[in-house]
């Protein structure tokens, strides 16, 4: 059988080889398509409800005014010329429809390095056969399930036209220190050969590199946190992040009921001020981050350093916030 590829909605003429060019003709066409069960016979004298789909022209050719999906199948003509010689023609008809240019919808303008991000959804509408969607990064094909690339695909068929809508959602995990403006595009490859791919307009999201959080530093004055009774201790919370986060203070793991401040002053230290102190920096984008804990202790006269003794009561004594 001769393979014929026809575009949906377009006319198609199939020649009946060996048929006399004009009536009277001894010929018949037989169709086995999505519109028939087994074979449907059409003759030149025909003329009827099938004419909207296929009719025999005066020259014996079969004319399909607007090919549809249901016209895929086998078409055979059997003709006898004036001398009684029989000729058979056999066609295998396949149909196709090229969709509109694919589009990337819900595209991200910014991606975050090191974490999975949805880049966008590629949509192609009105293809037959279904065909495929593929993604490209800087012009090179992206392979799903490799190097942080994942693709979620969906195929739907229109209940009336039978044409396909394809959707492909791309997720990527950009490498840290990679291209700050990668170029993504998507292309539709038809299900039938000899038709070139259709490509979307590219998108270029920015890649945002999250700055690794530097540690919250807690600086104690005097160094070591050991002070004579009645002395003063100054705790300073240093956070490199911009904008400056809110700083709260903890003592022995319990938040101190004080307004936020980067400096905590403990004047006139008494036993009740002894304990373990830390600060908590709260960033709007990252959440809370706690410093190391430092131990504040009282040195009795004649001692060299912090006592190994017990922590005093939980009384706050007199605190000053700078």
């Amino acid at each position: 059988a001769q393979n014929i590829t026809a575009r949906i909605g377009e006319p198609l003429v199939l020649k009946c080889k060996g048929a006399p060019k004009k009536p009277p003709q001894r010929l018949e066409w037989k169709l086995n398509t999505g519109r028939t069960e087994a074979w449907k016979v059409l003759s030149p004298q025909g003329g009827g409800p099938w004419d909207s789909v296929a009719r025999v022209l005066p020259n014996g050719s079969l004319f399909l005014p607007a090919v549809g999906i249901q016209d895929e199948g086998i078409f055979r003509c059997q003709a006898m010329n004036r001398n009684g010689k029989e000729t058979k023609s056999n066609y295998r008809v396949r149909v196709y429809q090229i969709p509109g240019k694919p589009e990337i919808v819900d595209s991200a303008s910014e991606l975050t390095a090191g974490v999975p991000n949805k880049v966008g959804t590629c949509v192609s509408e009105g293809s037959y056969p279904a065909g495929t969607l593929s993604w490209h990064l800087d012009g090179k094909p992206l392979v799903p399930n490799e190097k942080g690339v994942s693709v979620k695909e969906q195929t739907r068929r229109h209940p009336e036209t039978g044409l396909f809508t394809l959707q492909s959602e791309l997720m990527v995990t950009p490498a840290r220190g990679g291209d700050p403006r990668p170029t993504f595009s998507c292309s539709f490859s038809p299900g039938l050969p000899r038709h070139r791919a259709l490509r979307t307009a590219p998108i270029q999201p920015r890649v945002w590199e999250p700055v690794p959080l530097e540690e919250v530093q807690l600086v104690v004055e005097p160094e070591g946190g050991a002070v004579a009774p009645g002395g003063t201790v100054t705790l300073t919370c240093e956070v490199p992040a911009q904008p400056s986060p809110q700083i709260h203070w903890m003592k022995d793991g319990v938040p101190l009921p004080l307004p936020p401040s980067p400096v905590l002053i403990l004047p006139e230290i008494g036993p009740q001020d002894q304990g373990t102190y830390s600060c908590v920096a709260t960033h709007s984008s990252h959440g809370p981050q706690e410093s190391r804990a430092v131990s504040i202790s009282i040195i009795e006269p004649g001692e060299e350093g912090p006592t190994a003794g017990s922590v005093g009561g939980s009384g706050l004594g007199t605190l000053a916030l700078a």
């Epitope: 519109r35 028939t36 069960e37 003329g47 009827g48 409800p49 004419d51 909207s52």
Partner: antibody, heavy 119, light 107 residues
Framework: EVQLVESGGGLVQPGGSLRLSCAAS????????MTWVRQAPGKGLEWVAS????????YYPDSVKDRFTISRDNAKNSLYLQMNSLRAEDTAVYYC????????????WGQGTLVTVSS | DIQMTQSPSSLSASVGDRVTITCRAS??????VNWFQQKPGKAPRRLIY???NLADGVPSRFSGSRSGTDFTLTISSLQPEDFATYYC?????????FGGGTKVEIK
């Protein structure tokens, strides 16, 4: 919504002529074949004529061939049936219907118009 | 020409009954048969198209089936509004041919 409205029926003498019209709305008229079907009083349905969407091809049963002519004006969304040499047996309600080919066959009908052929 | 032989020409049934109407084509018409319902003084309404497909807005108690050249319309549970005349139509070839009709009456 699809609507088909027939008009032009009435009383006519044997041998006379009548022209029926069908005004179509609610769909793309030139995409569809159109058909006339009739029903004699107390009888069944009988196909009268069909026309393809372009108007180039027309189809009739032997009972009306050479007497009736189906036509259409796609610009006016209108279907017509010109009936000549009318006989008593042509007395019927005439319906216009959408379709008539194997793709769409008589999915919507008008309410009908009565033609009476009598002396 | 194709003949469509419809049977029975009339039947009496009660609400809730299962009703079956048959049309036999004199030659192969493929799937190209429709079923219509007509009430007195009204235009026909398509119920089933291409032998087995339920037309839009038609209750699911109506169904169509095909076995070769035999076509059947079934009403699974007859309702008061179903008392009417039913016709089959062959549209595979010209002349388009209707069955003679089946009048469904109240028992």
């Amino acid at each position: 919504e699809v609507q088909l409205v027939e008009s032009g029926g009435g009383l006519v003498q044997p041998g006379g002529s009548l022209r029926l019209s069908c005004a179509a709305s609610g769909f793309t008229f030139n995409n569809y074949w159109m058909t006339w079907v009739r029903q004699a009083p107390g009888k069944g349905l009988e196909w009268v004529a069909s026309i393809d969407n372009s108007g180039d091809n027309t189809y009739y049963p032997d009972s009306v061939k050479d007497r009736f002519t189906i036509s259409r004006d796609n610009a006016k969304n209108s279907l017509y049936l010109q009936m000549n040499s009318l006989r008593a047996e042509d007395t019927a309600v005439y319906y216009c219907a959408r379709g008539g080919d194997i793709i769409i066959s008589l999915d919507w009908w008008g309410q009908g118009t009565l033609v009476t052929v009598s002396s | 020409d194709i003949q469509m032989t419809q049977s029975p020409s009339s039947l009496s049934a009660s609400v809730g009954d299962r009703v079956t109407i048959t049309c036999r084509a004199s030659q192969d018409v493929g799937i190209y048969v429709n079923w219509f319902q007509q009430k007195p003084g009204k235009a026909p309404r398509r119920l089933i198209y291409r032998a087995t497909n339920l037309a839009d807005g038609v209750p699911s108690r109506f169904s169509g089936s095909r076995s070769g050249t035999d076509f059947t319309l079934t009403i699974s549970s007859l309702q008061p509004e179903d008392f009417a005349t039913y016709y089959c139509l062959e549209f595979d070839e010209h002349p388009l041919t209707f069955g003679g009709g089946t009048k469904v009456e109240i028992k």
